[in-house]
Amino acid sequence: PTGAVEVQVPEDPVVALVGTDATLRCSFSPEPGFSLAQLNLIWQLTDTKQLVHSFTEGRDQGSAYANRTALFPDLLAQGNASLRLQRVRVADEGSFTCFVSIRDFGSAAVSLQVA
């Protein structure tokens, strides 16, 4: 490892109404010369480590979470690893971890509250 990837998420929980869409913000600082082929991005449920969404080998691997999640592909190269969760349900409430690996890795958890 050359130096940990710093991953930033909001400190405060994201609050969403049932049925609306929520954005779980996550960002990292890409180094000069960074390309998406180097990126491994994994969103997981923090406690269970269940896979939610991933981007590896230069492409979006899609949602593993009831097909209700999406990344912002046009913003990934700038370090925006945020996740869109569609049609929020009460059962979605909890902590989501954004795991970013380039050459080294880092991770951070963001909480979702459903109102």
Partner: antibody, heavy 116, light 108 residues
């Protein structure tokens, strides 16, 4: 380059408490990473014990949860393991390691023997 | 918890030969949620492969990983003297994270 180093007593009495510390060098323990304890015994192989995030949030292995406490000291750039009510079955090499998913890097490991 | 079963327990090969190590998971996992480690006597495990097929920093290209679902493979194309060691797989798709029991690659 982040390096990890475990320290603590190599011998603990049955029913006592195992206490180990992992010193992090070459980087800050406050970075966005999880810090783990893993042990290795001849009987059970490699076994994840638990993890801590710089915020203090912890997750523990269900099989050890009732006996384990992991804490972090950001001012000393270190984190610690306490395992109470130990028995001979807790004799193992204990490693600290970094990572939420895979583990990298690892400390060199320290052998802890539970014996009277 | 997910149980990982590695086979064979021991693999006896000569330098220059190809090694194929198997790891089976008790539940299907996404391929990006599996890692491989190498451990030599008296040393800590060393990360080789993550995401089933991505080599960690500094790992030679003779090491490769593949697989999906419940069946995963670590291949070493041409064994070098320093490759004789114990290899472990690990899953991180379910908590607690768990390891296989290891495959020892020994000199024939």
């Amino acid at each position: 380059q982040v390096q990890l180093q475990e320290s603590g007593p190599g011998l603990v009495k049955p029913s006592g408490t195992l206490s180990l510390t992992c010193a992090v060098s070459g980087g800050s323990i406050s970075t966005s990473n999880y810090w783990n304890w893993v042990r290795q015994s001849p009987g059970k192989g490699l076994e994840w014990i638990g993890e801590i995030y710089p915020t203090g949030n912890t997750n523990y292995s269900p099989s050890l949860k009732s006996r384990v406490t992991i804490s972090i000291d950001k001012s000393k750039n270190q984190f610690s393991l306490k395992l109470n009510s130990v028995t001979a079955a807790d004799t193992a090499v204990y490693y600290c390691a970094r990572g939420y998913n895979w583990f990298d890097p690892w400390g060199q490991g320290t052998l802890v023997t539970v014996s009277s | 918890e997910i149980v990982l079963t590695q086979s064979p327990g021991t693999l006896s090969l000569s330098p220059g030969e190809r090694a194929t190590l198997s790891c089976r998971t008790s539940q299907s996992i996404n391929a990006i949620l599996l890692a491989w480690y190498q451990q030599k006597p008296g040393q800590a495990p060393r990360l080789l492969i993550y995401g089933a097929s991505s080599r960690a920093t500094g790992i030679p290209d003779r090491f490769s990983g593949s697989g999906s679902g419940t069946d995963f493979t670590l291949s070493i194309s041409r064994l070098e003297p320093e490759d004789f060691a114990v290899y472990y797989c690990q899953q991180y798709g379910s908590s607690p994270r768990t390891f296989g029991q290891g495959t020892k690659v020994e000199i024939k």
